[in-house]
């Protein structure tokens, strides 16, 4: 099976790497524009220069291209707690990230929110906080893990998953209650 190619890919594959086929004349291969620039005018003929112009402020191209316009720079989502790691340049988009002791939770492939790393109070750090993953905690005896926080077994209801972890405590509480009914 031959992989399906879009019109642009088909046209580009006729020319050597770093060149693209002239949109009005398929016998001409024009040199692509360098990153940080965009296509202003196609080359007039074989061996002649493509007219490439530098991206304006607030826009970029990160690879060689024959785009008619530069791409708009991304803006960091302050409402999601994001901070700017590096600002946009003509050849590189804005890089957004999180503050120290925070991790990214991805809502979708390109939308993330910053959350504080768990401190594992009443427990120990099993796996340290990573760029895209919260700390993994192990709880001390008498505590169980709920939403990555160590919660006292006194808050464990029989219907919850914590019953196995907190079984001795629950039995003790039950035993204490029973002993008062003589």
């Amino acid at each position: 099976l031959v992989p399906h190619l879009g019109d642009r890919e088909k046209r580009d594959s006729v020319c050597p790497q770093g060149k693209y086929i002239h949109p009005q004349n398929n016998s001409i291969c024009c040199t692509k524009c360098h990153k940080g620039t965009y296509l202003y005018n196609d080359c007039p003929g074989p061996g002649q220069d493509t007219d490439c112009r530098e991206c304006e402020s607030g826009s970029f191209t990160a690879s060689e291209n024959h785009l008619r316009h530069c791409l708009s720079c991304s803006k960091c989502r302050k409402e999601m707690g994001q901070v700017e790691i590096s600002s946009c340049t003509v050849d590189r988009d804005t890089v957004c990230g999180c503050r120290k002791n925070q991790y990214r939770h991805y809502w979708s492939e390109n939308l993330f929110q910053c959350f504080n790393c768990s401190l594992c109070l009443n427990g120990t750090v099993h796996l340290s906080c990573q760029e895209k993953q919260n700390t993994v905690c192990t709880c001390h005896a008498g505590f169980f893990l709920r939403e990555n926080e160590c919660v006292s077994c006194s808050n464990c209801k029989k219907s919850l998953e914590c019953t196995k972890l907190c079984l001795p405590q629950i039995e003790n509480v039950k035993g204490t209650e029973d002993s008062g009914t003589t």
Epitope: H105, W107, S108, E109, N110, L111, Q113, F115, E147
Partner: nanobody, 117 residues
């Protein structure tokens, strides 16, 4: 095919409450991030609130923090938005949405919330 059906919108007085519901089908709801998006008259789409598959992570727009609560019932494939202390500026069409690469691609038909005296 992702299908999202909102209900619960209506006319409410300032300070009043509404609870929006969203019935989801056509995908694995349990493990999916979900949210509510709104579009006020003449404005763009904005995320109001988001919740992850297990309900551990949530997001609230600054304008609704402390007033709105997002929740989900994975056994019913349903997403909720409890809206309290409603204000005139909350008037908008509210959409149930599944975040995607193009942020607002997967959303329902919307339910109109009007806050007016």
């Amino acid at each position: 095919e992702v299908q999202l059906l909102e209900s619960g919108g209506g006319l409410v007085q300032p300070g009043g409450s509404l609870r929006l519901s969203c019935a989801a089908s056509g995908f694995t709801f349990k493990g999916s991030n979900m949210g509510w998006v709104r579009q006020a008259p003449g404005k763009g789409l904005e995320w109001v609130s988001l919740i992850d598959g297990r309900g551990q992570h949530t997001y609230y727009a600054d304008s609704v923090k402390g007033r709105f609560t997002i929740s989900r019932d994975n056994s019913k494939n349903t997403l909720y938005l409890q809206m309290n202390s409603l204000r005139a500026e909350d008037t908008a069409v509210y959409y149930c949405a599944k975040p995607s690469v193009r942020e607002f691609d997967y959303r329902g038909q919307g339910t109109l919330v009007t806050v007016s005296s």
